[in-house]
């Protein structure tokens, strides 16, 4: 059967029919349906939503829709013993306490089971001591404190502002600095955009609003008790002491009203420079401790949260491929939310729902994709990407042999300015070509392509005339597919203007105020940006599942490998003397990149010229494309991060959200001048260069003619 026979209508017609079927009004309706009550992972409400989605996907026409469950470690506040922070006087009396909950938004006052703000997986504890303000608690912030300002955080409670990096990295850094507790807060400088009102009158964070979130450092492990294996009925579970990635000190988040009360009394050292000062009317002194009259007062944390093994549910829908049913294209996004999930995740889940509906309509008209499409509604993403990771662990053998691509579908919007895409270089050309065919939803770009508005508003920093596409990092459900399994992955959403809006994430992220009304009133009243994101995500899935030749371009990997090799070489050349002393050479890596470039171009020539009507040849060439991403996987993983196995990309060791290129070499070089044994440290650099060289060369060989 040829592809066109399998699909009954011409490919262009199919794609147009699929895109035309997507409707903004449906996305709006689905979003409203998904956001009326909280859907916290591990709760009955979220189980009911899983069953609802299962039922609707079946109605939409998928071949099968199953629930898969796992029993994973989750974390909840104690319902009768709330978490809070207090200022205590010298007699131990609490003279100030932080709020126990966020004031609920109008219309939601009677909603039950709104989980109060907490840091998921915080251990219990009641540390007390002096406060130290540590800015964003980034690696460089602690370097500034400890090395330049000679401030010791040992035995202190640190207070850090949210933003810039993943909160788990902040906690890890604080632990390493010897802190006994961490207070996280949202500074208006990062979460209150100038000229915009607070919710419910605008999209800014009110003073009582708080960002929830997990504070794990899982490094891709999934369920902390069953790393590497699915958390099923017969799984061996580690004890809590051996669990992966749990913080060892109490952590709690607060809003800026409460933060004001803690920070206004701060004494000790002044902040080192303006980059350490937020927008509150406080001095932003670093401490330690309170100033003058308040110097005898201390801060005390009261954390009583519990971690417990809890059942979670993924929904997995299948649309069987007509020609290559054993090749899987996956569209996945999570379903669990911290509270209502108006943006995160339901703006994404609503888009997935509409994409499923559109594919279902085509199927009902007799069409099938060439390859199998799997749709996933993941659970427990907010607790460490648990649902997706456990499912991938359970199905790893199938996925590594059959996985063509994974498209992520969390929040569809984090702003309404322009498109934002992170993906493997293999997908660059797919994304460019697709966005050239889609209409821009942006004001002032009527009748223009999405590619045009995206390029204008978010130009590539390196390549003029092209839009920016970023590296994949982590912090979302593509992690296991890309970083562990080496399945080509991508994500797309609408974003803010990063030039003018310096706030981190969107202001109401993970707060109770992330509601349907937030989206409908302030972000996307016409749901046109949601529709565009549906077209991009859906269009990518369609092309990946239906094109005869996979829409991957290995030449774009050659381009970025050259760029990344240049970048890491330039970093190492900040140490020219040591490079000489320890005979560190990048010649082999540059040679491997050149070989990759040459072989990729020859492969592309063969790809253009081969007989596409020969099914064996076609499958052979497609397999070379599919397995290229897999070829960048090192089975041994990165040092101390065995589940991050991609040699070209990994989440930054300093910020889980950000991607780092040649991470093994990068980490070996990081702060190398401070290493106690330089010979050993530069030996590790050389080892990492050799691993990278081998991997690039081996990947190149997979593109060579097979015989």
């Amino acid at each position: 059967k040829s592809s066109s026979e399998a699909t009954n209508i011409t490919p262009k017609h199919n794609m147009k029919a699929f895109l035309d079927e997507l409707k903004a009004e449906n996305i709006k309706k689905f979003l409203h349906n998904f956001t009326q009550i909280p859907h916290l992972a591990g709760t009955e409400q979220n189980f009911q939503l899983a069953k609802q989605i299962q039922s609707q996907w079946k109605e939409f026409g998928l071949d099968s829709v199953e629930l898969t469950h796992y029993d994973v470690l989750l974390s909840y506040p104690n319902k009768t013993h709330p978490n809070y922070i207090s200022i205590i006087n010298e007699d131990g009396n609490e003279i100030f306490n932080t709020s126990l909950f966020e004031p609920p938004p109008a219309g939601y006052e009677n909603v039950s089971d709104i989980v109060p703000p907490f840091s998921a997986f915080s251990p219990q504890g009641m540390p007390e001591g002096d406060l130290v303000y540590v800015n964003y608690a980034r690696t460089e912030d602690f370097f500034k404190l400890e090395r330049d300002m000679k401030i010791n955080c040992s035995g202190k409670i640190v207070i850090a502002r949210y933003g810039k990096v993943f909160r788990g990295n902040k906690v890890k850094n604080a632990q390493l600095a010897g802190a006994t507790g961490v207070i996280l807060y949202s500074d208006p400088d990062d979460y209150f955009a100038p000229g915009v009102k607070s919710y419910p009158d605008g999209w800014n964070l009110p003073g009582g609003g708080v960002q929830r979130g997990n504070i794990l450092n899982l490094n891709g492990a999934g369920d902390p008790l069953t790393p590497g294996y699915p958390a099923n009925e017969y799984a061996y579970r580690r004890g809590m002491a051996e669990a992966v990635g749990l913080p060892s000190i109490p952590v709690h988040p607060i809003g800026y009203y409460d933060a004001q009360k803690l920070l206004e009394k701060m004494g000790g050292s002044a902040s080192p420079d303006s980059s350490w000062r937020g927008s509150l009317k406080v001095p932003y002194n670093v401490g330690p401790g309170f100033t003058g009259n308040f110097s005898t007062q201390k801060v005390k944390m009261h954390i009583h949260s519990t971690s417990e093994v809890t059942r979670i549910y993924n929904v997995i829908g299948t649309l069987r491929g007509a020609v290559e049913p054993d090749r899987y294209v996956i569209l996945g996004g999570h379903r669990d939310s911290w509270v209502f999930g108006g943006i995160d995740p339901q703006s994404g889940a609503a888009v997935v729902h509409e994409i499923v509906r559109s594919f279902g309509m085509l199927k009902k008209e007799g069409w099938r994709p060439r390859r199998t499409i799997l749709f996933a509604s993941w659970d427990a993403e907010e607790f460490g990407l648990l649902g997706s990771t456990e499912w991938a662990e359970e199905n790893s053998r199938l996925l590594q042999e059959r996985g063509v691509a994974y498209i992520n579908a969390d929040s569809s919007i984090e702003g309404n300015y322009t498109l934002r895409v992170d993906c493997t270089p293999l997908m660059y050309s797919l994304v460019y070509n697709l966005t050239k065919e889609l209409e821009s939803p942006d004001e002032g770009f009527e009748g223009k392509s999405l590619y045009e508005s995206w390029t204008k508003k978010s130009p590539s920093p390196e390549f003029s005339g092209m839009p920016r596409i970023s590296k994949l990092g982590s912090g979302n459900d593509f992690e296991v597919f890309f970083q562990r399994l080496g399945i080509a992955s991508g994500r797309a959403r609408y974003t803010k203007n990063w030039e003018t809006n310096k706030f981190s994430s969107y202001p109401l992220y993970h707060s109770v105020y992330e509601t349907y009304e937030l989206v409908e009133k302030f972000y996307d009243p016409m749901f046109k940006y949601h529709l565009t994101v549906a077209q991009v995500r859906g269009g990518m899935v369609f092309e990946l599942a239906n094109s005869v030749v996979l829409p991957f371009d290995c030449r774009d990997y050659a381009v970025v490998l050259r760029k990344y090799a240049d970048k890491i070489y330039n970093i190492s050349m900040k140490h020219p003397q040591e490079m000489k002393t320890y005979s560190v050479s990048f010649d082999s890596l540059f040679s491997a990149v050149k070989n990759f470039t040459e072989i990729a171009s020859k492969f592309s020539e063969r790809l253009r010229d081969f007989d596409k009507s020969n099914p064996i040849l076609l499958r052979m060439m497609n397999d070379q494309l599919m397995f290229l991403e897999r070829a960048f996987i090192d089975p041994l993983g990165l040092p101390d991060r065995p589940f991050y196995r991609h040699v070209i990309y990994a989440p930054s060791s300093h910020n889980k959200y950000a991607g780092e290129s040649f991470p093994g070499i990068y980490d070996a070089l990081f702060d190398i001048e401070s290493k106690v044994d330089p010979s050993q440290a530069w030996g590790e650099v050389k080892r990492q260069i050799s691993i990278a060289t081998f991997t690039v060369q081996a990947a190149a060989e997979t593109l060579s003619e097979v015989a």
Epitope: E462, M466, D553, P576, S601, S604
Partner: antibody
Framework: EVQLVESGGGLVQPGGSLRLSCAAS????????MSWVRQAPGKGLEWVSA????????YYADSVKGRFTISRDNSKNTLYLQMNSLRAEDSAVYYC??????????????WGQGTLVTVSS | QSVLTQPPSVSAAPGQKVTISCSGS????????VSWYQQLPGTAPKLLIY???KRPSGIPDRFSGSKSGTSATLGITGLQTGDEADYYC???????????FGGGTKLTVLG
């Protein structure tokens, strides 16, 4: 046999624009990085810009950044250089060159015969 | 001012050997592959050496290339009058993300 044929050169006033083309044949055009290299009268070679194979990432010399735009049409096997805000110092013979390795610039194994651009009032 | 430094001119008699040097830095010649081009009067440049020391087909073995550290050298033995031309070295610069050339060396075959 590989052939590169440039066209579009000529006399233009300072501040003016010109678009150069390079018609390529004899190889899989889309797979190779392509560059423009110029040579002012009596002077040496100066690399101007390159565009990668694949999705067409672009690179520019500092002297032309923001004024020149390189592009390619793989369906027509043609390379372009859009030159805006031209200055007297842009006067040169402009050569189109093919990379000998693949998608990013390593060395130029084939060169066109060149097209003369004169910027003068 | 070129990123790579070449002598402006060299000369030798027919049959003799000549070398042309090309000096750069760790970010260009130090890590990347060097190529050499010959430009006969009034013609387009032609590739002479690539990957430091490889010759394209059709280039006689009288021409050779080498690289050491941050310098490269083009050698021509058995000089012929037809070798009179400008010679350019070129490479990629990993800091500039750009192709860089030497200023060119004019070879004169005496006699």
């Amino acid at each position: 046999e590989v052939q590169l044929v440039e066209s579009g050169g000529g006399l233009v006033q300072p501040g003016g624009s010109l678009r150069l083309s390079c018609a390529a044949s004899g190889f899989t055009f889309s797979s190779y990085a392509m560059s423009w290299v110029r040579q002012a009268p009596g002077k040496g070679l100066e690399w101007v810009s390159a565009i990668s194979g694949g999705s067409g990432s672009t690179y520019y010399a500092d002297s032309v950044k923001g004024r020149f735009t390189i592009s390619r049409d793989n369906s027509k096997n043609t390379l372009y250089l859009q030159m805006n805000s031209l200055r007297a110092e842009d006067s040169a013979v402009y050569y189109c060159a093919k990379d000998g390795v693949g998608a990013t610039p390593y060395y130029f194994d084939y060169w066109g015969q060149g097209t003369l651009v004169t910027v003068s009032s | 001012q070129s990123v790579l430094t070449q002598p402006p001119s060299v000369s030798a008699a027919p049959g003799q050997k000549v070398t042309i040097s090309c000096s750069g830095s760790s970010s260009n010649i130090g890590i990347n592959y060097v190529s050499w081009y010959q430009q006969l009067p009034g013609t387009a440049p032609k590739l002479l050496i690539y990957d430091n020391n490889k010759r394209p087909s059709g280039i006689p073995d009288r021409f050779s290339g080498s690289k050491s550290g941050t310098s490269a050298t083009l050698g021509i033995t058995g000089l012929q009058t037809g070798d009179e031309a400008d010679y350019y070295c070129g490479t990629w610069d990993s800091s500039l993300s750009a192709v860089v050339f030497g200023g060119g060396t004019k070879l004169t075959v005496l006699g």
